[in-house]
């Protein structure tokens, strides 16, 4: 195990459990989680005499690190005395030391509430030249407290002599003031009032609020995926609220149906994003039949920081329907990547744009994370198209060289699915890993350099081309093929690609 410095904890009894006439008491110090041995524990007992005993180190079974306890027994006027346990761990570094200072016993105490208040803006909503932050430490059992101001986590050099303490009944309150220049306040730094009390830390932080007019909060309401709707038959819709400023107020999402009928129970998820904003997602199961029959679902969002409620609604897309055409093909072997191939699937001319794309191998659906599928884009006509890309390994195609690209779409008949099979090495029996088959036809086309695929930009072969070696059981173009045009005095060239 690597070197690990110890965590140090004071061990004390509750004051109420120590008899008032006790002439001596024992307190302890726990050093745990260190490696390797040893640690050295020493005690500062002030003016009192004490005897110490350090117990042999024990091994923590899971980590293999060590733990040890040192006990101090003191006699005399111990009640008012503070004791310091000093733990040194030279393997961590020659000067590694952790000091814990504490009294013999811990009292029941009421912890403080820490709250930062800030001075108001002027009447016109502008910041004055200086901003006052007031740290209110309230409602704690009287005792020593330390107040520290931090700026972006760094201790500030602040005159704390201005801090004042008052007592109300059995509880005390303290306040400390910090004055900042407008420049510092507007710099978007975070200011923290950190209070240490009874060995615990309490804090509150503040910074210049974002403009009161929120920017960029957006809500989106998705339709169910065709896969969930037609295959799993458990469609859901999702209301997504993004770019919310995290705050103490919660986002309220309410679902309803235009028909007034009740909605199912929804599930909700909140996620803090890296940029500090909050994303809230609510997912509602909907009835397959209700959705297909055209029910409208509404998601209403309210939040303290949103001036207005906002509502999103969704329903089945209206308009013409067209089933997708599916074409699957494999890329040729690329130098340096003999053990990997990319399969591509072009799905086009479908309407409406809602589509689910899956890849299957060995009759098993591959995880969505395995493939990458574009968002639907409009074709030059009225339909939509997507591309899906799947990387496969030699081990997979040697096991079975048939991969299926399946599109799930409401206009596909008979079962809302259209699929095409593709092989890495088409035409090879058993799918054994041999080189790409030789093209069996020749494509001649003027104005093209030999060997360059002319459909790279998504075009198709010349109208006078015809396709060969395709699978006869496929309606439409074959997946990976060679096209031919009779040459008219031109040098022939071959092209293997999508017809």
């Amino acid at each position: 195990a690597s070197t690990q410095s110890p965590s140090v904890f004071p061990l004390t009894r509750c004051c109420k459990n120590i008899p008032s006439n006790a002439t001596s008491v024992t307190l302890g110090c726990l050093a745990t989680g260190y490696f390797p041995e040893p640690v050295m524990v020493t005690w500062d007992t002030g003016s009192l005499n004490g005897t110490t005993m350090t117990l042999p180190a024990t091994t923590l079974t899971l980590s293999g690190h060590y733990a040890t306890i040192s006990l101090l027994t003191v006699s005399g006027a111990w009640a008012k005395q503070m004791f310091t346990c000093r733990v040194a761990h030279t393997p961590s570094s020659t000067d590694w030391v952790d000091n814990k200072t504490f009294s013999v016993c811990s009292r029941d105490f009421t912890p403080p509430t820490v709250k930062i208040l800030q001075s108001s803006c002027d009447g016109g909503g502008h910041f004055p030249p200086t901003i006052q932050l007031l740290c209110l430490v309230s409602g704690y059992t009287p005792g020593t407290i330390n107040i520290t101001w931090l700026e972006d986590g760094q201790v500030m050099d602040v005159d704390l002599s201005t801090a004042s303490t008052t007592q109300e009944g059995e509880l005390a309150s303290t306040q400390s003031e910090l004055t900042l220049s407008q420049k510092h306040w507007l710099s978007d730094r975070t200011y923290t009032c950190q209070v240490t009390y009874q060995g615990h830390t309490f804090e509150d932080s503040t910074k210049k609020c974002a403009d009161s007019n929120p920017r960029g909060v957006s809500a989106y309401l998705s339709r169910p995926s065709p896969f969930d709707l037609f295959i799993r038959k458990s469609p859901t819709i999702t209301c997504l609220v993004v770019d919310l400023a995290p705050s103490k107020g919660t986002v309220n999402l309410t679902w309803s149906r235009a028909s007034g009928k009740p909605v199912n129970h929804s599930t909700r998820k909140e996620e803090k994003q890296r940029n500090g904003t909050l994303t809230v997602t609510s997912t509602l199961p909907v009835g397959t039949r209700d959705w297909i029959e055209g029910e409208t679902y509404q998601c209403r969002v309210t939040h303290p920081h949103l001036p207005r409620a906002l509502m999103r609604s969704t329903t089945k897309t209206s308009g013409p329907r067209a089933a997708p055409e599916v074409y699957a093909f494999a890329t040729p072997e690329w130098p340096g990547s003999r053990d990997k191939r990319t399969l591509a699937c072009l799905i086009q001319n479908f309407m409406p744009e809602d589509i689910s794309v899956q890849w299957l191998h060995n009759e098993v659906q591959l995880p969505d994370a395995r493939h990458s599928t574009t968002q639907p884009r409009k074709t030059k006509g009225s339909g939509f198209f997507v591309f899906s890309r799947l990387e496969v390994t030699r081990a997979e195609w040697e096991q079975k060289d048939e991969f299926i690209c399946r599109a799930v779409h409401e206009a596909a008949s008979p079962s809302q699915t259209v699929q095409r099979a593709v092989s890495v090495n088409p035409g090879l029996a058993g799918g054994s890993a041999q080189s790409q088959r030789a093209p069996d036809r020749v494509l001649c086309h003027s104005g093209q350099q030999q060997g360059l695929p002319r459909a790279a930009g998504g075009s198709v072969p010349h109208p006078r081309c015809h396709c060969g070696a395709g699978r006869a059981d496929w309606p439409g173009p074959p997946e990976l093929d060679v096209c031919v045009e009779e040459a008219e005095g031109e040098a022939p060239w071959t092209w293997t690609g999508l017809c």
Epitope: N213, P214, R215, G216, V217, S218, G249, Q298, R300, V301, T302, H303, P304, H305, L306, P307, R308, A309, L310, M311
Partner: antibody, heavy 119, light 110 residues
């Protein structure tokens, strides 16, 4: 049916203050965001302020500081306090209810109360 | 801040005419755009909300269209009671500019 009735308008001297009230009936006020809109004589509509169902408020940039919107759901009333009145504040002030949908517009308006600032 | 520019500021038309009023936003509006009709001495009345949804009780000759920054209100066949001033308003929850209303379009009898 939904009703919004504004009151509190009138003739006031420059520098004075007014508190406009909007009594709401026929619906649950606490469910709706509420807005004040004003219209100077012969001019277009001008948004003043909005208060959401949580009681948080926003103002048009020019209104910040002198205008204060508030609501008392228990009294079914929305208020607009205007301080340091100027001649340019002369207008009909409308109290308006945002659609329950939210972010969709104003589906009910009061008849308005006329504020005239003149010495 | 989003600014709403309405055009034309006035239009003369006859009963039965098709009238289109446009409203351009200085930034894309992701939430609702509303259209109002106002007659002299009356408060405005909601015609269209959420870009294109007809408010309750509004005749179907009124329609709203558009997205992003360009919006339009169309009256397919102008009726005598339609002579009024029309305003667009962005009801975007994320923006509170100096004025969320367009400048207005007065539809007058030719």
């Amino acid at each position: 049916q939904v009703q919004l009735v504004e009151s509190g308008g009138g003739l006031v001297q420059p520098g004075g203050s007014l508190r406009l009230s909007c009594a709401a009936s026929g619906f649950t006020l606490s469910n709706h965001d509420m807005t004040w809109v004003r219209q100077a004589p012969g001019k277009g509509l001008e948004y003043v302020s909005i208060i959401n169902t949580y009681g948080n408020h926003w103002y048009a940039n020019w209104a910040s500081g002198r205008f204060t919107i508030s609501r008392d759901n228990s009294k079914n009333t929305v208020y607009l306090q205007i301080d340091s009145l100027r001649a340019g504040d002369t207008a009909t002030y409308y109290c308006a209810r945002e659609t329950h949908h939210g972010s969709s517009g104003i589906d009910h308006w009061g008849q308005g109360t006329l504020v005239t600032v003149s010495s | 801040d989003i600014q709403m520019t309405q055009s034309p500021s006035s239009v003369s038309a006859s009963v039965g005419d098709r009238v289109t009023i446009t409203c351009q936003a200085s930034e894309s509006i992701y939430s609702g755009l509303a259209w109002y009709q106002q007659k002299p001495g009356q408060p405005p009345k909601l015609l269209i909300y959420d870009h294109s949804t007809l408010a309750s009780g509004v005749p179907s000759r009124f329609s709203g269209s558009g997205s992003g920054t360009e919006y339009a209100l169309t009256i397919s066949s102008l009726q005598p009671e339609d002579f009024a001033t029309y305003y667009c308003q962005h009801a975007d929850y994320a923006h509170h500019s100096d004025n969320v209303f367009g400048g207005g379009t007065k539809v007058e009898i030719k």
